[in-house]
């Protein structure tokens, strides 16, 4: 079994709906700095045929562009294949569909391999509740506290949300 964290009870459909990005982490800081390729923010998610579809917001030229991405299911329940800035093995690390989701990606771009983690929540007012869980997952996979960026409202394209 790949990772001991299973997909949410009731299936991926429970992940559907609105989400808010709270924190990012990476061993390669350039990826999550402002204008970094993984400084992107979740808007919403849906699931179909075992695949995860996400609308993400990407800051560009002072605006935020909404882009749709699909993470395709694999033989492993918590692992997905995502083509974005290279190839990504995307893992659902910790999931509470009503509250928060922690994912991490092993990104391969040209000859470079990097680790990126992402914390998202349903309710922004509760974001502090889930940061310790994110820090714990990050530590476990080898990302340190100083490699975590906690996002502000200005960061996460709040103005671009419907």
């Amino acid at each position: 079994q790949e990772g001991n964290h299973e997909e949410p009870q009731g299936g991926l459909e429970e992940l559907s709906g609105r989400w808010h990005s709270v924190a990012l982490a990476s061993n390669k800081s350039d990826l999550i700095k402002p204008w970094g390729h993984f400084r992107v923010f979740i808007h919403s998610m849906s699931a179909k045929d075992g695949n995860l579809h996400g609308d993400i917001l990407i800051p560009q030229d002072g605006q935020c562009e909404k882009v749709s991405l699909t993470a395709f299911k694999t033989a492993t329940s918590n692992k997905f294949d995502l083509e974005y800035w290279g190839h990504n093995d995307l893992y659902l690390a910790e999931v509470d569909p009503k509250s928060y989701l922690i994912l991490y990606m092993i990104n391969q771009y040209n000859d470079d391999t990097s680790l990126v983690a992402h914390l998202m929540v349903r309710d922004l007012s509760r974001q502090q509740d889930f940061l310790p869980a994110f820090e714990s997952v990050c530590e476990d996979i080898g990302l340190h506290k100083d490699q975590i960026v906690v996002l502000s409202d200005d960061d996460r394209c709040q103005g671009s949300r419907d």
Epitope: Q1, E2, G3, N4, T113, I141, G142
Partner: nanobody, 122 residues
């Protein structure tokens, strides 16, 4: 002093199973992601699988996905690689290595064992 010692290799028929062990000691939590790599004759060393510090998170190369399982017992400072449905192309020297981050690249691993030979042949 950092040490990683592999064991459990041997000769096995195609379709058979082996369990490799990697006993580690002497390093801090910072280098406690453990990976398995392998090197077949005349080929470069390649990533096989890795496991996070707690054992909660794992990563495999595609060719072994579903056949190999990596696990760890932190109380015994040991990481295991259960290899099922072995194929002749799995023949290689298998190395365990310790690194700081769950990535499938050799250069991320600072400490290496001496290796154990796995031969899959009828």
């Amino acid at each position: 002093q950092v040490q990683l010692v592999e064991s459990g290799g041997g000769l096995v028929q195609p379709g058979g199973s082996l369990r490799l062990s990697c006993a580690y000691s002497g390093f801090t939590l910072d280098n406690n992601v453990i990976g398995w790599f392998r090197q077949a004759p005349g080929k470069e060393r390649e990533f096989v699988a890795a496991i996070s510090r707690s054992g909660a998170f794992t990563h495999y190369t595609e060719s072994v996905q579903g056949r190999f399982t990596i696990s760890r017992d932190n109380a015994k400072n040991t990481v295991y690689l259960q290899m099922n449905s072995l194929k002749p192309e799995d023949t290689a020297v298998y190395y365990c290595a310790a690194g700081a981050i769950l990535l499938p690249t050799e250069r991320r691993y600072d400490y290496w064992g001496q290796g154990t030979q796995v031969t899959v042949s009828s």
